[in-house]
């Protein structure tokens, strides 16, 4: 599947997941904490201040690194899955902290967490960027 299609599909699913999570957690615009978000790469569930959210590497990296195998499971499509099954020491896991000032940046950054073969990528001339 082309990356544009993957992103549009994942973004739509993300917004649905966030809405369901907001209802489950009783979140609204005035709630303290961090709203769920689609960062143009992957989906982040709403979180309370002090909470660390872990996600598996997004689908994009299966295009970038078709041979890459991660030990972690992919987060379920119907909801946000169980973050407790993920561990930051695993390859293929990215985290964000919810602070009083909002979300931190991903840790590690996506390339460091998900792997990126810079030299392999230069063999093809395909464009993997997408329309936001």
């Amino acid at each position: 599947m082309h990356s544009d299609c993957i992103f549009k599909k994942e973004q739509a699913m993300c917004l649905e997941k966030i809405q369901r999570a907001n209802e489950l957690m009783g979140f609204n615009d005035s709630s303290p904490g961090c709203p769920g978000m689609w960062d143009n790469i992957t989906c982040w569930k709403p979180a309370h201040v002090g909470e660390m959210v872990l996600v598996s590497c997004p689908e994009l990296f299966r295009i970038f690194n078709p041979d890459q195998v991660w030990e972690t499971e992919t987060i379920g499509e119907s909801d946000f899955g169980d973050s407790n099954s993920l561990d930051l020491s695993d390859m293929g896991v990215v985290s964000r902290n919810c602070t009083e000032d909002g979300w931190s940046e991903p840790f590690p950054h996506y390339f460091d967490a998900c792997g990126f073969d810079e030299y392999e990528s230069e063999t093809g001339d395909q464009d993997y960027y997408y329309l936001s």
Epitope: N40, E105, E122
Partner: antibody, heavy 120, light 107 residues
Framework: QVQLVESGGGVVQPGRSLRLSCAAS????????MHWVRQAPGKGLEWVAV????????YYAESVKGRFTISRDNSKNTLYLQMNSLRAEDTALFYC?????????????WGQGTLVTVSS | EIVLTQSPATLSLSPGERATLSCRAS??????LHWYQQKPGQAPRLLIK???QSLSGIPARFSGSGSGTDFTLTISSLEPEDFAVYYC?????????FGPGTKVDIK
């Protein structure tokens, strides 16, 4: 090897505009975030802006927000910085740097810089 | 924004000596703290990523430690080419920031 070459610097009067360019080669430009970082003469480094691999995410330092615009043309392997309403305190050597990430990342390779002097 | 403070501002040492540079963040940056070296007339060079991760091509005498708000860059035995300015940089929260730098000069 990764190469970043900045251009477009020069002497400009306060209030005027300038556009910097950064030509990238030696890596798949369209897959990496890119940064602008500046350094005033004899001073330290100041982070200016970052743009994600496709241009969908752009972030700025407070000191330049609303005046500077970061953009990229992946078909030309070129990064840009449009600088409007320039001030004397914008005088600096402007570096473009590759971000080791798709979204933001930390700068891992740097160009040699282009000097911007804002003076009347 | 997160403010990074580096100390000392200047470190005067002789070749062969050990250099210990400090970087303190105004709030936690986890391990998203990176170190750069800059020599006069040159662009900065990435030395250490994520507080302590070494990079290929960087001599083993450079090492980093710390997490949260306190970080250290150590040069185990100074070589003549190590006299330069060292900057820490946080990529934990936007806007990203650099420390003011520590100049390591020859005593």
């Amino acid at each position: 090897q990764v190469q970043l070459v900045e251009s477009g610097g020069g002497v400009v009067q306060p209030g005027r505009s300038l556009r910097l360019s950064c030509a990238a080669s030696g890596f798949t430009f369209s897959r990496f975030a890119m940064h602008w970082v500046r350094q005033a003469p004899g001073k330290g480094l100041e982070w200016v802006a970052v743009i994600s691999f496709d241009g969908g995410n752009k972030y700025y330092a407070e000191s330049v927000k609303g005046r500077f615009t970061i953009s990229r043309d992946n078909s030309k392997n070129t990064l840009y910085l449009q600088m409007n309403s320039l001030r004397a305190e914008d005088t600096a050597l402007f570096y473009c740097a590759r971000g080791y990430d798709i979204l933001t990342g930390y700068p891992d390779y740097w160009g040699q810089g282009t000097l911007v002097t804002v003076s009347s | 924004e997160i403010v990074l403070t580096q100390s000392p501002a200047t470190l005067s040492l002789s070749p062969g000596e050990r250099a210990t540079l400090s970087c303190r963040a105004s709030q936690s940056v986890g391990r998203s703290l990176h170190w750069y070296q800059q020599k006069p007339g040159q662009a900065p060079r990435l030395l250490i990523k994520y507080a302590s991760q070494s990079l290929s091509g960087i001599p083993a005498r450079f090492s980093g430690s710390g997490s949260g708000t306190d970080f250290t860059l150590t040069i185990s035995s100074l070589e003549p080419e190590d006299f330069a300015v060292y900057y820490c940089h946080q990529s934990s929260r936007l806007p990203f920031t650099f420390g003011p730098g520590t100049k390591v000069d020859i005593k």
